[in-house]
């Protein structure tokens, strides 16, 4: 779940379609699975399989469901309260530096190194030097590693390249 959404990511709702349930906002906010009406008086349900909202919100539109790319498998479908969950196909992984695409895992380790970690949807194979046990310098850190280290690790302002 990450940033920079564009206008097409906001899924326009049909005007008061019969199947869209309405309820009243609570403290100006609508519950997950809903968005707020333009006049702020109603909460309108998202459309199953088309759009969603995950938290209490004052969104004018629900967010459009992600469609898994080729090279990805759908782990769970989009519901009104949760976006589609996509995962790289077997033999490929999504690295932190290019999260928009799945990349092929390496088939083996360089000479003088031994494999200590398998290819997963989140990481390439992990290689270490036979003697020193240190990781290969070209190793891409697994996404899981960045998640577990995220709490307070930024001791200095982090930067966004671009």
């Amino acid at each position: 779940e990450s940033a920079l959404i564009t206008q097409q990511d906001l899924a326009p709702q049909q005007r008061a379609a019969p199947q869209q349930k309405r309820s009243s906002p609570s403290e100006g906010l609508c519950p997950p699975g809903h968005h707020i009406s333009e006049d702020g008086r109603d909460c309108i349900s998202c459309k199953y399989g088309q759009d969603y909202s995950t938290h209490w919100n004052d969104l004018l539109f629900c967010l459009r469901c992600t469609r898994c790319d080729s090279g990805e498998v759908e782990l769970s479908p989009c519901t009104t309260t949760r976006n589609t969950v996509c995962q790289c196909e077997e033999g490929t992984f999504r690295e932190e530096d290019s999260p928009e695409m799945c990349r092929k895992c390496r088939t083996g380790c360089p000479r003088g190194m031994v494999k200590v970690g398998d290819c997963t949807p989140w990481s390439d194979i992990e290689c270490v030097h036979k003697e020193s046990g240190t990781k290969h310098s070209g190793e891409v850190p697994a996404v899981e590693e960045t998640v577990t280290s995220s709490p307070g690790t930024p001791a200095s302002p982090c930067s966004l390249s671009g």
């Epitope: 779940e1 938290h55 004018l60 967010l63 992600t66 966004l160």
Partner: nanobody, 125 residues
Framework: EVQLLESGGGLVQPGGSLRLSCAAS????????MSWFRQAPGKGLEFVSA????????YYADSVKGRFTISRDNSKNTLYLQMNSLRAEDTAVYYC??????????????????WGQGTLVTVSS
């Protein structure tokens, strides 16, 4: 290159208010969804609120609904979090976050690749 710097934290009594700011430098934030997370002492990261791109609306965690308000001033390249009716359980380091993937608002640590330094909020009498 964008750098994020939070400010506005401090010591406040229960029931009091604070306004946190997150100043971004190096690039406009107007086209980015941005979020606030917090980490209480000895606990994991918790999503607080997210500001969706282009004033499309905002997300709030159940725990802060009706008490906190997220906003932004694109002309000042700054994200805000107005915190009212503060409680002891709101004590935490508050982080401003942004990610680079063109998808949806950041509501989990997995999607938050870029963090500010954090600002400490202590609610105590």
């Amino acid at each position: 290159e964008v750098q994020l710097l939070e400010s506005g934290g401090g010591l406040v009594q229960p029931g009091g208010s604070l306004r946190l700011s997150c100043a971004a430098s190096g690039r406009s934030i107007s086209n980015y969804a941005m979020s606030w997370f917090r980490q209480a002492p000895g606990k994991g990261l918790e999503f607080v609120s997210a500001s969706v791109w282009n004033n499309g609306g905002n997300y709030y965690a159940d725990s802060v609904k009706g008490r906190f308000t997220i906003s932004r001033d694109n002309s000042k390249n700054t994200l805000y979090l107005q915190m009212n009716s503060l409680r002891a359980e709101d004590t935490a380091v508050y982080y401003c976050v942004v990610a680079r993937t063109p998808e949806t608002p950041i509501t989990s640590a997995r999607g938050a690749n870029y963090w500010g330094q954090g600002t400490l909020v202590t609610v105590s009498s």
